[in-house]
């Protein structure tokens, strides 16, 4: 019995459906076949959970989170043993194995691994300002989705028509921050974040108002 | 303690119905296949039907195919058994049966766990 | 559906005795049989699983042995509370089969 090499990892938008293949040789029939499909959660690698389960002609469900959202991809018994799972969840992350025996074939690789990432396109960040907005002060944009995966970047830029930073500007894509030193008049207006990732984007909108010094009243 | 019991067993005339339920505690039921087996009077035992825990895969007896419909409700840890146009040979004890995969020889499926039983009689 | 044969149907035997029950399928099961005692008005119990495992909490006077189509239940020495119907069972395939059983009586 044989498992064929699997594409080692399979990347899949969250709610989407993933596919995780498993195929086999065998010189054996398959009226004995029994697949186990078990996942090694990347949220909890110590806690490895069974996904569905083929013996003796009958189906088993795994653990309750995947019921309704797994099946094999085909009919059983058959040597493509692929599942499916639908209604792809951040806790679906993780590594997947296919376990295979259909005695009396015994010996080769029975075993296929399979890494599902799930990914997640940033949630609507949040945009907000840290320090005074005075002229001449310095203040900080700070801009953060709490969802996204692969962690987001990004990028601020000025709503005006030349869409770029003032010169007084440095920016961390990593962190979501911009810096601006002693602001000016100039330094007002719109900002926008746009956090990005493999699969998609979001925007938050800022508005810097800096603000002048009041002339006082020489009595 | 792990417990099944069953109810709705009866008198029935050939022909009628009969809806047989199963209560389970002392598990996460919604964790396990079940199944009903049965044994008539004086004979062996006979599976008649399996459910796997999400409902997804059912599967029956060819004795009983077409007429019986297993089904089970997870937030009550409930097993039922609607038994149709049933037959003189359906009278048997019901048993209510829990079953667990097991890591041996790959894996292998077994009944682990039994109810007391509830008796049905076919007659007229 | 896989038939299995049990033998002999019924033994009458003593206390203290060494029992040996057989079990034939009708094709190799590969070691999928498992094993079940019942008393008179009781549900069944598993004893045995996967041909040889015991059952957590089973005495250990009773043992599984076997291999393809031929499989046997040993009671190593008979105790008054072995006195019962064993069944076997295989999970090799759907529809699950029994044995008709073998009633073990006192002689």
């Known amino acids: 019995l044989e498992v064929s090499e699997s594409p080692g990892s399979i990347q899949v938008a969250r709610g989407q459906p993933a596919v995780l293949p498993c195929t086999f040789t065998t010189s054996a029939a398959l009226i004995n076949l029994n697949v186990i499909w078990m996942v090694t959660p990347l949220s909890n690698a110590n806690q490895p959970e069974q996904v569905i389960l083929y013996q003796g002609g009958q189906m088993f469900d795994g653990a309750p989170r995947f019921h309704g959202r797994v099946g094999f991809t085909g009919t059983m018994p058959a040597t493509n043993v692929s599942i499916f799972i639908n209604n792809t969840q951040l806790s679906d992350t993780g590594t997947y194995q296919c376990l295979v025996n259909n005695l009396p074939d015994i010996g080769g690789r029975n075993i296929g691994v399979t890494g599902l990432t799930v990914l997640v396109p940033p949630s609507a960040p949040h945009c907000q300002i840290q320090g005074s907005q005075d002229i001449g002060s310095d203040v900080i944009l700070l801009c953060s989705s709490e969802e996204g995966i692969p962690r987001p970047t990004y990028l601020w830029e000025k709503l005006d028509n030349t869409l770029k930073l003032p010169p007084t500007a440095t920016q961390d894509q990593v962190q979501g921050t911009v810096t601006i030193r002693n602001i000016s008049a100039l330094s007002s207006g719109l900002y926008q974040c746009v956090a990005s990732n493999a699969i998609g984007t979001s925007t938050c909108l800022l508005d810097l108002q800096v603000i002048s010094p009041q002339p006082r009243n020489i009595g | 303690e792990v417990q099944l019991v069953e109810s709705g067993g009866g008198l029935v005339k050939p022909g009628g119905s009969l809806r047989l339920s199963c209560a389970a505690s002392g598990f996460t039921f919604s964790s396990y296949s079940m199944n009903w087996v049965r044994q008539a009077p004086g004979k062996g035992l006979e599976w008649v039907s399996s459910?796997?825990?999400?409902?997804?895969?059912?599967y029956y007896a060819d004795s009983v195919k077409g007429r019986f419909t297993i089904s089970r409700d997870n937030a009550k840890n409930s097993l039922y058994l609607q038994m149709n146009s049933l037959r003189a040979e359906d009278t048997a004890v019901y048993y209510c049966v829990r079953s667990i995969i097991v890591q041996a020889l790959g894996i292998t499926s077994v009944f682990d766990i039994w109810g007391q039983g509830t008796m049905v009689t076919v007659s007229s | 559906a896989i038939r299995l044969t049990q033998s002999p149907s019924s033994l009458s035997a003593s206390v203290g005795d060494r029992v040996t029950i057989s079990c034939r399928a009708s094709q190799i099961i590969s070691n999928h049989l498992n094993w079940y005692q019942q008393k008179p008005g009781k549900a069944p119990k598993l004893l045995i699983y996967?041909?040889?495992r015991l059952q957590t909490g089973v005495p250990s006077r009773f043992s599984g042995s076997g291999s393809e189509t031929d499989y046997t239940l040993t009671i190593s020495s008979l105790q008054p509370e072995d006195f019962a119907t064993y069944y076997c069972?295989?999970?090799?395939?759907?529809?699950?089969?029994f044995g008709h059983g073998t009633k073990v009586e006192i002689k």
């Open positions: 996967a041909a040889s």
């Open positions: 069972q295989q999970s090799y395939s759907n529809p699950r089969t």
């Open positions: 459910i796997s825990s999400s409902s997804s895969y059912i």
